[in-house]
Interface confidence: medium
C-alpha cells in the first residue's frame, strides 16, 4: 500500500493544533430524518440546509422541514425557517438554485390536498424570501433558463407546461399534456406533447415542439417522437420508424429546423439509447443490445452527430434508466472510464485516453497484488467501482472523483484482478489522468478534493461504528495524516465541500443518537493554516499530459495536440488559492490516420488504423440524407475526429456534393424538410442526459 504515517512521509508540522483551531462544530436541534445541502452561488460561502421529517398517515404524508443558512462555508448556521413561514419544503425537489452566481433560490412547498402549490423565492442568496402561490402543483423541480435566471419552466402534476418570465412572480400556461420539457440554448424551450391526453401510453406518438419566444409562438419540429434529448449543440429525437416498434435517432444542429440521419442501429421497444456524454464537438451514444442482455455498444459521433464509429462493445448498462459506470475523467482531456460485461459475465473496467478511439484495461497499480479473480497472479488490471457496484449493494460509498482544476488527479474505489471483485474495495489514486494508479487507502472511504488538488481529504466508511477521524494528504495521496476532529464519534453520513474543489473547507456531517435524543451535527474544518503560504512559481513543475514515450516526437499528442501543464509539486505544501487558474501550453501535432474517424460507408478492421470500405457498399454511390437534402459523398474513407486540432502530416481528401434533391421520410412531420434518423429513450422518458444539480442528500 501507499506510505501511511511513517518516516518516509513528509509530515505537516503542528497540524493537530492548526486544525483544532479551525474546526467548527454546529449542532442542529432537530429530529428530522433526512438532510440536504445546496450551495448558493460560487465562492459566496452560502449554504442552505434543508432538514425534513415525513410521516405517512393513511393516504397523505404529514411532514415538517427546517431551513438553515450559512454564509461562512458551513462553520456557522442560522435557522431561517421563519423566513418561509415554517412551511414544509419538499425534500425531493424542494431547493432549486439559480444558474451561475445569480443568487436566486426557489423553494417548492408541499401543500397537501391543494389544487395549487406555493413557492418561496429569493434573489439575494437566501437572505430574504417572497412567498408566491402557484396555480398548479409541480411534478418536478422548477427549471431555470441557463441564459436568464428570471425565466422559469415548470411541469405540473397534470402534465401542463408553465412558464414565468419574472422569476416566478407570474405564471402562464404554455401547453397541455406535455410529457417532457427542456430548456435549450437562447431561452428556447423544447417539449413533447400528446394530443391523446396521456404520457404513459402512446410513447412513440408524441409531437416535438419548440418555442423560441417563451410561448408567443410554437413550431412542431417532429412527430412520431418517442423521446428527445439535448447534448452539447445537438438535439436528438428518437422516432418511430414505421417498421413495427422500431425507433431510430434523428439529430439536428439547428434547433430542429432540419434533421439528419444518425448512422446508428434502430432499436425495439425493449431497448434504449442513452447519451453518455456530449459536448459541442461530439457525442458518446450507448445503443442497447436486444433482449435483457444488460449491455450494449458505445458509438462516438462525428462533428455533426450523424456518422458514428463503434467505440466499445459489450458496454455495461443494465436496463432503461439503469446503471452504467461510464465516467468522464474531467481532470484530463479525452479520458473516460467505464465497465464492460465480459463473455464470462464478469464485469471489467476499461479506459480510453483518446475520447473513445481505443479502450484498454487499467494498468495494475505497482503497489498492489492481483486478487483471487486473477488467473495469472502476476498479470491483472485495476477495476473501478462506480454506479453499478453501488447499485448491487457493494460497500462503495462514492463514485470516482476528478476535478478539471485538479489536473491529472482521479480518485476511485477499486479492486485488482481479472474483473471487479465483490470483496471490500480499496481507494486508488491516479495523478496522471488514469495512466498509472497507486493504492492510497485501505478499505472504503468518502473522499473529496480541496484547493484544486492541494489537499485530498478522506473519511473511512464505517457503518457499524462512529467516526471521529479525518485523513488528509497534501501530496496527491502518497502520504496521509490523521486528525481526530471530535472526542465523541458521530454516526457519519457524508462529506460536503463546495463544488469546484477550490475551497479549503470540508464539512463532516452525521448525527448523534441516544435512547431519548437524536440530532444532526456538522464539523467544518478549514485547512487554511495547513497550507500557510501562497504557492509561488518554484512550487510548480512542468508536466506533459498523456506522455507515454518521451522519446517520441509526437509524445503526448491526443486529438491532434499536446498540452504541458504547470502542476503543483508533491513536496510543496502551499495554497493554490481560490483564484487558481490551470496553466497550460498547447502545441499542435502533425496529423496521422489516428486523427481521423472512418467516414460513412467505411470501417476500421481490428488493430488497423486504415479505414476500408464496407463490403456491402463497395462500388455503390454513397448517398445519404443531410439537413433534408440528398448528398453524394466522395471520400477516401476518413473524416477528422471532432475536436482534433492536428495540422499537416497525413491529409485524406473528402468532398460532399449536394445532389439538389430533397429527401424526406415519414419519421418526422411531412410538412417539413425531414430525414431518416435514429432515436432514444432513457430513464424518465428522455435520453439519459447526465446533468445533475449540485445537491447533497443524506438519510439515516
Amino acid at each position: 500500500s501507499a506510505p501511511g504515517e511513517d518516516e518516509e512521509c513528509g509530515r505537516v508540522r503542528d497540524f493537530v493544533a492548526k486544525l483544532a483551531n479551525n474546526t467548527h462544530q454546529h449542532i442542529f436541534n432537530d429530529l428530522s430524518g433526512s438532510v440536504s445541502l445546496s450551495w448558493v452561488g460560487d465562492s459566496t460561502g452560502v449554504i442552505l440546509v434543508l432538514t425534513t421529517f415525513q410521516v405517512p398517515i393513511f393516504m397523505i404524508t404529514i411532514g415538517q422541514s427546517k431551513l438553515y443558512r450559512s454564509e461562512d462555508y458551513g462553520k456557522n448556521f442560522k435557522d431561517i425557517t421563519d423566513l418561509i413561514n415554517n412551511t414544509f419544503i419538499r425534500s425531493d425537489f424542494g431547493i432549486a438554485i439559480g444558474p451561475e452566481n445569480s443568487g436566486k433560490v426557489v423553494l417548492t412547498a408541499d401543500v397537501s390536498g391543494s389544487h395549487g402549490s406555493r413557492i418561496f423565492r429569493s434573489s439575494d442568496f437566501a437572505k430574504n424570501f417572497v412567498q408566491q402561490e402557484l396555480p398548479f402543483v409541480p411534478l418536478m423541480q422548477i427549471m431555470y433558463s441557463p441564459q436568464n435566471s428570471d425565466y422559469l419552466l415548470a411541469l405540473s402534476n397534470k402534465n401542463e407546461l408553465w412558464v414565468s418570465k419574472n422569476f416566478g412572480g407570474k405564471w402562464e400556461k404554455l401547453y397541455d399534456t406535455v410529457c417532457l420539457a427542456k430548456w435549450g440554448s437562447d431561452n428556447t424551450i423544447f417539449f413533447t406533447a400528446n394530443h391523446n391526453g396521456s404520457c404513459s401510453n402512446d410513447r412513440g406518438m408524441l409531437e416535438l415542439w419548440r418555442t423560441s419566444d417563451l410561448g408567443k409562438s410554437f413550431k412542431t419540429i417532429g412527430s412520431k417522437i418517442y423521446s428527445f434529448g439535448l447534448g452539447g449543440r445537438f438535439l436528438f429525437a428518437s422516432v418511430m420508424t414505421g417498421k413495427g416498434t422500431l425507433r431510430a435517432i434523428h439529430v439536428s444542429t439547428d434547433q430542429g429546423d432540419t434533421w439528419s440521419m444518425a448512422q446508428l442501429p434502430p432499436v425495439g421497444h425493449e431497448q434504449f439509447y442513452s447519451i453518455l456524454a456530449a459536448n459541442d464537438d461530439m457525442v458518446f451514444m450507448h445503443v442497447d443490445e436486444p433482449g435483457d442482455s444488460g449491455f450494449g455498444t458505445i458509438f462516438t459521433s462525428d462533428d455533426r452527430g450523424i456518422v458514428y464509429s463503434k467505440s466499445l462493445e459489450r458496454h455495461l448498462y443494465t436496463t432503461t434508466g439503469g446503471e452504467t459506470d461510464f465516467t468522464n475523467v474531467t481532470s484530463l482531456r479525452g479520458v473516460y472510464i467505464t465497465s464492460i460485461l465480459a463473455e464470462d459475465k464478469s464485469v471489467q473496467s476499461m479506459i480510453t485516453f483518446d475520447q473513445g478511439g481505443r479502450w484498454t484495461h487499467l494498468r495494475k497499480p505497482e503497489n498492489s497484488k492481483c486478487d483471487a479473480t486473477a488467473r495469472d497472479p502476476e498479470k491483472c488490471s485495476l477495476h473501478i467501482h462506480a454506479a453499478y457496484s453501488i447499485a448491487t449493494g457493494l460497500n462503495v460509498p462514492m463514485l470516482p472523483l476528478s476535478e478539471p482544476n485538479a489536473v491529472g488527479i482521479v480518485i476511485a474505489h477499486g479492486s485488482v484482478g481479472d474483473a471487479i471483485s465483490v470483496m471490500r474495495p480499496d481507494v486508488y489514486i491516479s495523478d496522471d489522468g488514469g495512466y498509472s494508479w497507486t493504492k492510497a487507502l485501505e478499505g472504503p472511504h468518502h473522499y473529496t478534493i480541496l484547493d484544486s488538488g492541494g489537499i485530498i481529504v478522506a473519511v473511512e466508511q464505517n457503518a457499524h461504528q462512529g467516526v471521529n477521524q479525518i485523513k488528509f494528504s497534501t501530496d496527491e495521496g502518497q502520504c496521509w495524516q490523521t486528525y481526530n476532529f471530535t472526542k465523541d464519534p458521530i454516526f457519519f453520513t457524508g462529506l460536503a465541500s463546495e463544488p469546484g474543489a477550490r475551497s479549503m473547507n470540508i464539512s463532516i456531517w452525521g448525527y448523534r443518537s441516544s435512547l431519548f435524543h437524536q440530532y444532526w451535527i456538522s464539523y467544518t474544518i478549514d485547512f487554511k493554516d495547513i497550507l500557510e503560504r501562497n504557492c509561488e512559481e518554484k512550487d510548480y513543475t512542468i508536466w506533459l499530459a498523456h506522455s507515454t514515450d518521451p522519446e517520441d516526437y509526437e509524445d503526448g499528442c491526443i486529438l491532434g495536440y499536446k498540452e504541458q501543464f504547470l502542476r503543483l509539486r508533491k513536496s510543496s505544501v502551499c495554497q493554490n488559492g481560490r483564484d487558481y487558474v490551470v496553466t497550460k501550453q498547447p502545441s499542435i501535432c502533425l496529423c496521422s490516420l489516428e486523427d481521423f474517424l472512418c467516414d460513412f460507408g467505411y470501417y476500421r478492421p481490428e488493430n488497423d488504423s486504415k479505414c476500408v470500405e464496407q463490403p456491402e457498399l463497395k462500388g455503390h454511390d454513397l448517398e445519404f440524407c443531410l439537413y433534408g437534402r440528398e448528398e453524394h459523398l466522395t471520400t477516401n474513407g476518413y473524416r477528422k475526429i471532432p475536436g482534433d486540432k492536428c495540422q499537416g502530416g497525413v491529409n485524406p481528401v473528402r468532398e460532399v456534393k449536394d445532389l439538389k434533391k430533397k429527401c424526406t421520410s415519414n419519421f418526422l412531420s411531412p410538412e417539413k424538410q425531414n430525414s431518416k434518423s435514429n432515436g432514444s429513450a432513457g430513464g424518465s422518458g428522455g435520453l439519459n442526459d447526465i446533468f445533475e444539480a449540485q445537491k447533497i442528500e443524506w438519510h439515516e
Epitope: E551, D552, D555, K562, Q564, C591, G649
Partner: antibody, heavy 121, light 109 residues
C-alpha cells in the same frame, strides 16, 4: 552557459570515413534530442540526422541513410556522427544542434560553431 | 516530402524599414513545428522564432512570426543594421524529419 562544440572534421577521400564529435555543456544533455545539420559551400541548410534523448530512436535524411550513423554517450555528454562511404556532395560545414526537450519541439535552439568536412581526391 | 519555398530570394531594404519574408509549404504544416533562423556570414544559424509565432530567448520584439497551414511570414518591424543576413524557415515533419527553405537574403539597399 549552454554550449556545443564540434570536432573531427577534415579532408577525406571519396569512399572514406570520418567520425564527428559534439561536446555538450551547460544543460541536461540526456533530456534533449540532438541533430546534425550541414551546409554545403554557398548553399542552404540541410538536416542530416537526429537522435532522441536516450539514444533509443535515430532518424536520417534519405541522402545519408545507410552511410551515416548517429549515436550519443550521455555519460560523456557527447554526440557522434560516424560517416562512411563519403561522397563529394557530402562536403559541407556540419553543425551539431540541440533539438527538442521532452514534450515539445521548440526549434533548434542551440547550435555549435560547425566543423568542416571536405571530400575530395 | 514537404517542400518549403521562401520568397523573395533577395530582399533589398534600408535600416528603419519593415521587412516581410514569406515561407510557403507544399502541403499543410503544423504551426507548432515551424521555425525561423537567422544566419550571418561565417556564423552558425540562430533560432529566432519557433511554433510559428513564439520568439526564442533573447530575440528582440521587432521580430515576429505569423501564419498557419501553408503560408507563414517573418516580419521585422524596423530594420537594424545587424538584421541584414540570410533567413531560413524550417519545418518538423515526418519524413524527412526536418526540411529548410532555400533561404531569403536580406541585404542593405
Amino acid at each position: 552557459e549552454v554550449q556545443l562544440l564540434e570536432s573531427g572534421g577534415g579532408l577525406v577521400q571519396p569512399g572514406g570515413s570520418l567520425r564527428l564529435s559534439c561536446a555538450a555543456s551547460g544543460f541536461t544533455f540526456s533530456s534533449y534530442a540532438m541533430n546534425w545539420v550541414r551546409q554545403a559551400p554557398g548553399k542552404g541548410l540541410e538536416w542530416v540526422s537526429a537522435i532522441s534523448g536516450s539514444g533509443g530512436s535515430t532518424y536520417y535524411a534519405d541522402s545519408v541513410k545507410g552511410r551515416f550513423t548517429i549515436s550519443r554517450d550521455n555519460s560523456k555528454n557527447t554526440l557522434y556522427l560516424q560517416m562512411s562511404s563519403l561522397r563529394a556532395e557530402d562536403t559541407a560545414v556540419y553543425y551539431c544542434t540541440r533539438g527538442r526537450g521532452i514534450g515539445y519541439y521548440n526549434g533548434m535552439d542551440v547550435w555549435g560553431q560547425g566543423t568542416t568536412v571536405t571530400v575530395s581526391s | 516530402e514537404i517542400v518549403l519555398t521562401q520568397s523573395p530570394g533577395t530582399l533589398s531594404l534600408s535600416p528603419g524599414e519593415r521587412a516581410t519574408l514569406s515561407c510557403r509549404a507544399s502541403q499543410s504544416v503544423s504551426s507548432s513545428y515551424l521555425a525561423w533562423y537567422q544566419q550571418k556570414p561565417g556564423q552558425a544559424p540562430r533560432l529566432l522564432i519557433y511554433g510559428a509565432s513564439s520568439r526564442a530567448t533573447g530575440i528582440p520584439d521587432r521580430f515576429s512570426g505569423s501564419g498557419s497551414g501553408t503560408d507563414f511570414t517573418l516580419t521585422i518591424s524596423r530594420l537594424e543594421p545587424e538584421d541584414f543576413a540570410v533567413y531560413y524557415c524550417q519545418q518538423y515533419g515526418s519524413s524527412p524529419m526536418y526540411t529548410f527553405g532555400q533561404g531569403t537574403k536580406l541585404e542593405i539597399k
